[in-house]
């Protein structure tokens, strides 16, 4: 058993039929010694008396706020939380595996640019008595400071049958060095606790493996002269990290028919202009990538031919 | 460039881009098999890293930027002589047209454009290398790799801004 | 074409070293380890060891250690292995192979130690 | 040391027959695993790496198989050309060991 935050305790059980549980001894926060009496949630039923109450947990039916009184009074409370163990590993119920880029891929985040700051989300299929709690760091031994707000929800989808719903939080390393090669990774660690099932989720990752740019801005068509061809211009988009000269991106520019059949042409150019040929009906998308180092490509910012 | 002179950043430039994309194609290289699981021992965590405080930053670069260059040639020496050792030259044979062969020269080439014969910076960091294992070796070379190609993005980016703002 | 040719049958008097030679030719003589094996007369293959041409590192088998030395010249794509202090036990032919999954070994190099 | 076990020792076929040579390691090698035949008077020839993967050069009736600690190599229908010593041999680690080998004869 550990202490989640004040009054709130996670209990560890290897989840199979039969399991013998672990036993756990609340102490009733008071100065008090007798005439102590303990109850479970809501209920009036009297579990025991005194200052300690000694208890087997075994399943969620063990699990919730226990509470000590005194003469009608309530003296403190102990909320109790189960942490399950399937098969000697933490069960994964309450957020949805996103299967990107890997199996057992629950925490997904991303940053626009080098300064520390990244976003990451998770799914779950659950809308109610549900909390999430995010803690980070960069490294794990002798961690460095990051500092994330609180997660919330950010989107709600519907899948088939289901809602699905995304929540998300927004992380900052304190002491960020955008220049400097990464050697040590930033961990991530989600709280989830649904009613009195705790579950906890984490990930690990450079910022470097994380990072899109947002889409080029300004995406524009000039016409060349007594020609098919145009001349395409873009800029870098606001949000990536400056100079330019130093944070360098590399481009693709594609030209799509209306028909996905269509063939794409592309090119690839590390300047913020190109020259294509403009189909009849066709758009003309660019997208953004880290030039010196393969991480993900922006989204597309597109322009119709015509 | 030892002794304050100033590196051919352009040459610089082209040939560190050059180190990004044969980093990130030699990567797929894992050999005879999959790479089963990475692993969590620490396989590469004496590699030099450009620091916080290596000056390779844009005002670090503008302020003396022999700091940030020795700092990478001292990275290229490192990993040119990783990639020499039998981490790469043993069992599970690399084929003979592997990116990692020219990944190699060009490492050379760029840290022979910083110090070229004759100029010295002091001594370098050199990899302890005992002889790896052939069943570690592939999980190695992922890791070595994987952390090449952060270093050279790095690198590529001094390189590029030193080209941008600091040539002649 | 791959080949390792090396160098002819050697008789030697108990005591006496010897230097055998192994030149590489059709690749990249520093891309690959050379490692030498040792075959007595109508028995099994033994790994003496190997040496890296790029930077000479070698690596022996604890069996062979003292009893072998293995060098290299990259001028000349040679790798060498010298045995010293020989005895009958160390009559054999021995050779030279390139990586183990590359299927390239030398003719070999007979040694026979007799008084 | 990890210590490669051949059987049989030797082993007499008829041209045509199927035939499967036993590799054991004393400790589980992966797939580590290479297999050569050593003709009377010839250097030893590479036939199979990594437990089953064929080389070029080597005609496909030899064929690699298992994982772990126990490896055979099959002939599916041998030949007068193929007597001669089959040797397997540990690739995981060092020291690198050789089986004892498996002749094999033609009746």
């Known amino acids: 058993i550990w202490e989640l935050k004040k009054d709130v305790y996670v209990v560890e059980l290897d989840w199979y039929p039969d399991a013998p549980g672990e036993m756990v001894v609340l102490t009733c926060d008071t100065p008090e010694e007798d005439g102590i009496t303990w109850t479970l949630d809501q209920s009036s039923e009297v579990l025991g008396s005194g200052k300690t109450l000694t208890i087997q947990v075994k399943e969620f039916g063990d699990a919730g706020q226990y509470t000590c009184h005194k003469g009608g009074e309530v003296l403190s409370h102990s909320l109790l939380l189960l942490h399950k163990k399937e098969d000697g590993i933490w069960s994964t119920d309450i957020l949805k595996d996103q299967k990107e880029p890997k199996n057992k891929t629950f925490l997904r985040c991303e940053a626009k640019n080098y300064s520390g700051r990244f976003t990451c989300w998770w799914l779950t299929t659950i809308s109610t008595d549900l909390t999430f709690s995010v803690k980070s760091s960069r490294g794990s031994s002798d961690p460095q400071g990051v500092t994330c707000g609180a997660a919330t929800l950010s989107a709600e989808r519907v899948r088939g049958d289901n809602k699905e719903y995304e929540y998300s939080v927004e992380c900052q390393e304190d002491s960020a060095c955008p220049a400097a090669e990464e050697s040590l990774p930033i961990e991530v660690m989600v709280d989830a606790v649904h009613k009195l099932k705790y579950e906890n989720y984490t990930s690990s990752f450079f910022i470097r493996d994380i990072i899109k740019p947002d889409p080029p801005k300004n995406l524009q068509l000039k016409p060349l002269k007594n020609s098919r061809q145009v001349e395409v211009s873009w800029e870098y988009p606001d949000t990536w990290s400056t100079p330019h000269s130093y944070f360098s991106l590399t481009f693709c520019v594609q030209v799509q028919g209306k028909s996905k059949r269509e063939k794409k042409d592309r090119v690839f150019t590390d300047k913020t202009s190109a020259t294509v040929i403009c189909r009849k009906n066709a758009s003309i998308s660019v997208r953004a990538q880290d030039r010196y180092y393969s991480s993900s490509w922006s989204e597309w910012a597109s322009v119709p031919c015509s | 460039v030892p002794g304050g002179s100033s590196p051919a950043w352009t040459q610089c430039q082209q040939l560190s881009q050059k180190l990004c994309t044969l980093a990130w194609s030699a990567h797929p290289l894992v050999g005879h098999m999959d790479l089963r699981e990475e692993g969590d021992e620490e396989t590469t965590n004496d590699v030099p890293h450009i620091q916080c405080g290596d000056g390779c930053d844009p005002q670090g670069l503008r302020d003396n930027s022999q700091f940030c260059l020795q700092r990478i040639h001292q990275g290229l020496i490192f990993y040119e002589k990783l990639l020499g050792s039998d981490i790469f030259t043993g069992e599970p044979s690399l084929l003979p047209d592997s990116p990692v062969g020219q990944l190699h020269a060009s490492l050379l080439g760029l840290s022979q454009l910083l110090q070229p014969e004759g100029h010295h910076w002091e001594t370098q960091q050199i990899p302890s290398l005992s002889p790896s294992q052939p069943w570690q070796r592939l999980l190695l070379r992922f890791k070595i790799l994987r952390s090449l190609q952060a270093f050279v993005a790095v690198a590529a980016r001094v390189f590029a801004h030193g080209a941008a703002t600091l040539s002649p | 074409e791959v080949q390792l040719q090396q160098s002819g049958p050697e008789l030697v008097k108990p005591g006496a070293s010897v230097k055998m030679s192994c030149k590489a030719s059709?690749?990249?003589?520093?891309?690959?380890?050379m490692h030498w094996v040792k075959q007595k007369p109508g028995q099994g293959l033994e790994w003496i060891g190997y040496?890296?041409?790029?930077?000479?590192?070698?690596n022996y088998n604890e069996k062979f250690k003292g009893k072998a030395t293995l060098t290299s010249d990259k001028s000349s794509s040679t790798a060498y292995m010298e045995l010293s202090s020989l005895t009958s036990e160390d009559s054999a032919v021995y050779y030279c192979?390139?990586?183990?999954?590359?299927?390239?070994w030398g003719q070999g190099t007979l040694v026979t130690v007799s008084a | 040391d990890i210590v490669m076990t051949q059987s049989p020792a030797t082993l007499s076929v008829t041209p045509g027959d199927r035939v499967s040579l036993s590799c054991r390691a004393s400790?589980?090698?992966?797939?580590?695993l290479h297999w050569y035949q050593q003709k009377s008077h010839e250097s030893p020839r590479l036939l199979i790496k990594?437990?089953?993967q064929s080389i070029s050069g080597i005609p496909s009736r030899f064929s690699g198989s298992g994982s772990g600690s126990d490896f055979t190599l099959s002939i599916n229908s041998v030949e007068p050309e193929d007597v001669g010593v089959y040797y397997c041999?540990?690739?995981?680690?060092?020291?690198?060991?050789f089986g004892g080998g498996t002749k094999l004869e033609i009746k």
């Open positions: 059709g690749y990249t003589f520093t891309r690959y380890l």
């Open positions: 192979s390139l990586n183990w999954d590359y299927a390239y």
């Open positions: 041999q540990n690739g995981h680690s060092f020291p690198y060991t």
């Open positions: 990594y437990a089953s």
């Open positions: 040496i890296n041409p790029y930077n000479d590192g070698t």
């Open positions: 400790q589980s090698i992966s797939d580590y």
